[in-house]
């Protein structure tokens, strides 16, 4: 829990947060997500790095893999085969993009306590996973997929056409990884391991982004990534399914694309196995307002996959793009044909619907002026989901159970009253058949993870309560946080304000706006954090505000889709509107207002600084987008359409930071970017800098050599130290 205000007599023992606290991660918290292996058992890595199996029902635990074994191969991760005979140990982790990495894998045989010798796995492997039953292995090596019946067997090579930067089998290319699948893998086992589905991405015709990686050598090397920017040629995707018992019988069979999708450029968006012989694929038109869910069945006689038109379900948006950030995925019920899915209702709120035959006949399961966010699990009699319904705070998350076995279905909030002050933002992790579940509370108080009975919802035990963190915070003067809303011209702007510990409404404080503001994002959340802005409030006496304006999520389609085809307009307007309202509150020094953001937030902060309002004295943009023509097709076109004359080229041109170069003349601007940013290319900041120089506008800049979009490691310390100096100088705060 957040320490309450202490009496003055104790106040001298309290200290403010320091920048060092933040950079050292002194006040970071832990969460506990059980690695479920059955209805009542889970694995967990203990503090001393043993892999321990816990049985909830017997209360017993035992070590299945010792830290000694882990250490013998420098393992940083593990995976138990479903038949519990083998464990893979992962070492030599080497990060690639956001989700992807390569690693070396060793297989440990639990029956004899030895590593499997003979037919060892090649290295490095791009992805590896066990089948859901038994101990088959699928893995991706050099962009090709391999299968092993058992770990000691020789592999069966499923694909042969894999080529670096050209053909990707079983793993996504850059754009699918970052903007569509949000995973490092693109292969999926059927529930009993009979079939393996996989995607093949052909990037042959995609333009390549090339940037220098300076390293330590005499000559820098060039990184080349097939990266489709807005309007460019996209990857060509195909989905195949192979019988893993008889993989050479007919080989991989391609799953047909629905005709209405295949008629023009399209994306594959996700694959969900229903049974061993039924699979559900989701497709999306390149113009991302039409999505098709296609249910396909295995034809034993032809050894092919049949996707009848009667099993195609269309989801179309007339006011924006399909879905939220991504199109939602279905959760199938036990009849293996009907499913539950979140999509917009007639009032424009995302809710759970039950689809039995057609989308038109869908039965709405939840409703109201709030949104269902995630379906966690569907059992025979219950559906567990999260929403922000409780007390009408969009930045909260509670877990609900709907009984689907009875009529009418009854709804119960599982989390709303558990630790009401401490916990308002939950996620959950369920065991098989939802026999048990873990709740992970992220705040606003100190995070806590608990274990619960899936039938009674009774708390069984605390898994992690962050006691050390609670004790460490006892003598820290934390800032106060409040979450409130502004009503402006029929728009609700929720904001979070972080106030100095001794905040006094009669005084004037410098204000820093922290902005992200990207479509379908949410910054105003009831979560715990001790971070850089906590320090700025605690030690430097700043007020920090985060505002969710138009384009942000979980408050209905009207707010979400307001930015459709017009990025860079309303997001900026709403930040400015909020600042004006904050000034009216009387405690903001209007001569000391700054704005900062990263990525999309860097774009918004740059546009806000260049808005010509005179509101902002200074601001920072970290790794900003500067023109939507420079960013990835899948993301950009979802919200902006195509940069063509007959589509939306005009707004692409109007919404650049460069077009506003003149307006930076009256603000202090700090522009920051990593030179090896694979995501928002350094090109974006290079073009801003060029435009500012051409306009003879002074500005400050910092680049981070060989750093990507995350600016990690030592760069993080340098970055926050540098930004702190900049802000203190801007606000005339002494060092």
């Amino acid at each position: 829990l957040r320490p309450s205000r202490v009496h003055n007599s104790e106040e001298n023992t309290m200290r403010a947060l320091t920048l060092k606290d933040i950079l050292n991660g002194t006040f970071s918290y832990k969460t506990f997500f059980p690695n479920w292996i059955s209805g009542q058992e889970y694995l967990h890595q203990s503090a001393d790095n043993n892999i321990v199996l816990y049985n909830i029902e017997t209360g017993q635990s035992y070590t299945i893999l010792s830290n000694r074994t882990m250490k013998s191969v420098n393992a940083s991760n593990y995976g138990l085969s479903p038949d519990r005979q083998f464990v893979y140990l992962e070492s030599d982790y080497s990060k690639l993009w956001r989700y992807s990495y390569t690693a070396t894998y060793y297989i440990y045989d639990l029956s004899n306590g030895e590593f499997v010798r003979g037919n060892e796995l090649p290295r490095p492997i791009q992805y590896l996973c066990w089948s859901p039953v038994g101990s088959k292995l699928a893995y991706v090596y050099q962009n090709n997929i391999y299968l092993k019946q058992r770990p000691g067997d020789p592999p069966f090579q499923i694909t042969f056409n894999g080529r670096e930067n050209k053909i990707f089998n079983g793993i996504p290319d850059w754009v699918y990884e970052e903007e569509m699948l949000a995973t490092k893998y693109a292969l999926w086992w059927s529930p009993n391991g009979k079939f393996l589905a996989y995607a093949e991405f052909n990037d042959t015709d995609i333009p390549v982004i090339a940037y220098s990686y300076y390293g330590d050598e005499q000559y820098p090397r060039t990184i080349n990534i097939p990266y489709p920017k807005a309007g460019a040629k996209n990857p060509v995707v195909r989905i195949f399914i192979i019988d893993t018992t008889y993989p050479a019988y007919v080989g991989p069979q391609e799953v047909p694309v629905p005709a209405m999708i295949a008629s023009s450029d399209y994306y594959f968006s996700w694959l969900t196995w229903v049974t061993d012989e039924r699979v559900c694929l989701q497709w999306l038109k390149r113009v991302q307002n039409v999505s098709v869910l296609s249910i396909c069945d295995f034809r034993e006689d032809w050894q092919t996959w049949d996707c009848p038109k009667t099993q195609e379900h269309i989801e179309e948006s007339r006011t924006g793009w399909a879905g939220g950030f991504f199109v939602s995925t279905p959760v199938f019920s036990y009849d293996a044909i009907s499913y539950y899915k979140i999509f917009s209702d007639k009032d424009g709120y995302k809710h759970i619907h039950y689809i039995k035959d057609t989308v038109e006949n869908a039965i709405q399961i939840t409703s109201g002026k709030w949104e269902a966010i995630n379906i966690f699990r569907v059992t025979q009699d219950s559906l567990f989901y999260s929403s922000n319904e409780f007390e009408e705070y969009p930045g909260r998350r509670n877990i609900y159970r709907i009984s689907i076995g009875s009529y009418p279905p009854s709804k119960k909030c599982v989390t709303c009253h558990l630790r009401k002050e401490r916990c308002q933002y939950y996620t959950a992790s369920f065991s098989d058949y939802a026999k048990y579940y873990a709740l992970v509370c992220y705040g606003p108080g100190i995070p806590i993870s608990t274990l619960h009975d899936g039938r009674t919802d009774q708390e069984i035990k605390i898994l992690e309560e962050n006691k050390e963190l609670e004790n460490a915070l006892k003598n820290i003067q934390l800032p106060k946080e409040e979450i409130k809303k502004l009503e402006v011209d029929e728009i609700t702007l929720w904001y979070k304000m972080i106030l100095p510990p001794q905040f006094d409404r009669s005084k004037k404080y410098p204000l820093l706006i922290q902005v992200y503001g990207g479509p379908c994002s949410q910054s105003v959340r009831s979560v715990f954090a001790v971070n850089w802005i906590s320090y700025l409030a605690s030690k430097e006496g700043m007020v920090i505000a985060l505002v969710d304006g138009r384009g942000t999520a979980f408050q209905g389609d009207k707010l979400l889709y307001a930015v459709y085809r017009k990025l860079g307009v309303y997001e900026v307007e709403d930040q400015i509107t909020a600042v004006r309202k904050f000034i009216e509150m009387g405690f903001i020094d209007e001569k000391r207002i700054a704005i900062w953001g990263w990525s999309y937030g860097g774009y918004v902060s740059s546009l806000a600084l260049a808005s010509g309002t005179g509101l902002f004295k200074c601001g920072i943009a970290v790794a900003p987008v500067s023109s939507w023509e420079y960013y990835a097709s899948v993301y950009t076109e979802r919200f902006m359409g195509l940069p063509t004359k007959d589509d939306n080229l005009e707004h692409y041109k109007n919404s650049t930071v460069m077009a506003r170069a003149e307006y930076f003349r009256n603000v202090d601007y700090l522009l920051i970017h990593g030179t090896a940013d694979d995501n928002v290319h350094f090109q974006n900041s290079a073009q801003i800098a060029k435009a500012l120089v051409n306009a003879q506008v002074d500005f400050q800049a910092m680049w981070y050599s060989d750093q990507n979009h995350g600016l990690s490691g030592l760069s993080t310390n340098h970055l926050y130290t540098h930004m702190t100096h900049f802000l203190k100088q801007c606000f005339s705060l002494s060092d």
């Epitope: 299968l147 019946q149 058992r150 067997d153 020789p154 018992t245 008889y246 993989p247 050479a248 007919v250």
Partner: antibody
Framework: EVQLVESGGGLVQPGGSLRLSCAAS????????MSWVRQAPGKGLEWVSW????????GYADSVKGRFTISRDNSKNTLYLQMNSLRAEDTAVYYC???????????WGQGTLVTVSS | DIQMTQSPSSLSASVGDRVTITCRAS??????LNWYQQKPGKAPKLLIY???SLQSGVPSRFSGSGSGTDFTLTISSLQPEDFATYYC?????????FGQGTKVEIK
Amino acid sequence: EVQLVESGGGLVQPGGSLRLSCAASGFTFRGYIMSWVRQAPGKGLEWVSWIGPEGSRTGYADSVKGRFTISRDNSKNTLYLQMNSLRAEDTAVYYCARLLYGTWFDYWGQGTLVTVSS
Amino acid sequence: DIQMTQSPSSLSASVGDRVTITCRASQSISSYLNWYQQKPGKAPKLLIYAASSLQSGVPSRFSGSGSGTDFTLTISSLQPEDFATYYCQQATLLLPTFGQGTKVEIK
């Protein structure tokens, strides 16, 4: 280590029947396709039959179709070949082999000789 | 059924020789081609699977190549224990067929 041991071979008259067995050990028998391959004296190898891991799916060479039946008992880790209506040309050493991925024979038994003669 | 034709049917070679055996399929079998060694009175032994992959425990002097219809088994330096009969085998459509064999004899 993987071991396959055939038994049940012998001398049988044309038209007669014989049941071969293959006892498997050293691997998870229930997870693999198993097969019979034969070799007539002084001749090459000829595939006879295979059976899927679960036992429901089978395949036969045209030369034995309708006369031979392959089966397995996963609880006993044993593969069988029921041979009916035997002919002189069925005389061969019969090998039990694991048919990995339905593609290659990675482990073989030592073989059992079946002689069909009057 | 797919027919497999091996050549030569027999060959004489000396220890240290490089030996090449070819196998041709009557239609394309991708890379689903395997090679076996059989010594008199013994069961066959897998040498090469999937056209070019060396089975665990097999000496590296054995190698395989090819795809589609034409395949080769090469013994880079023939050893005394390599005198045996060699068979190629395919298994498309779950109908395995063997070549007629190549007998490698001492010259």
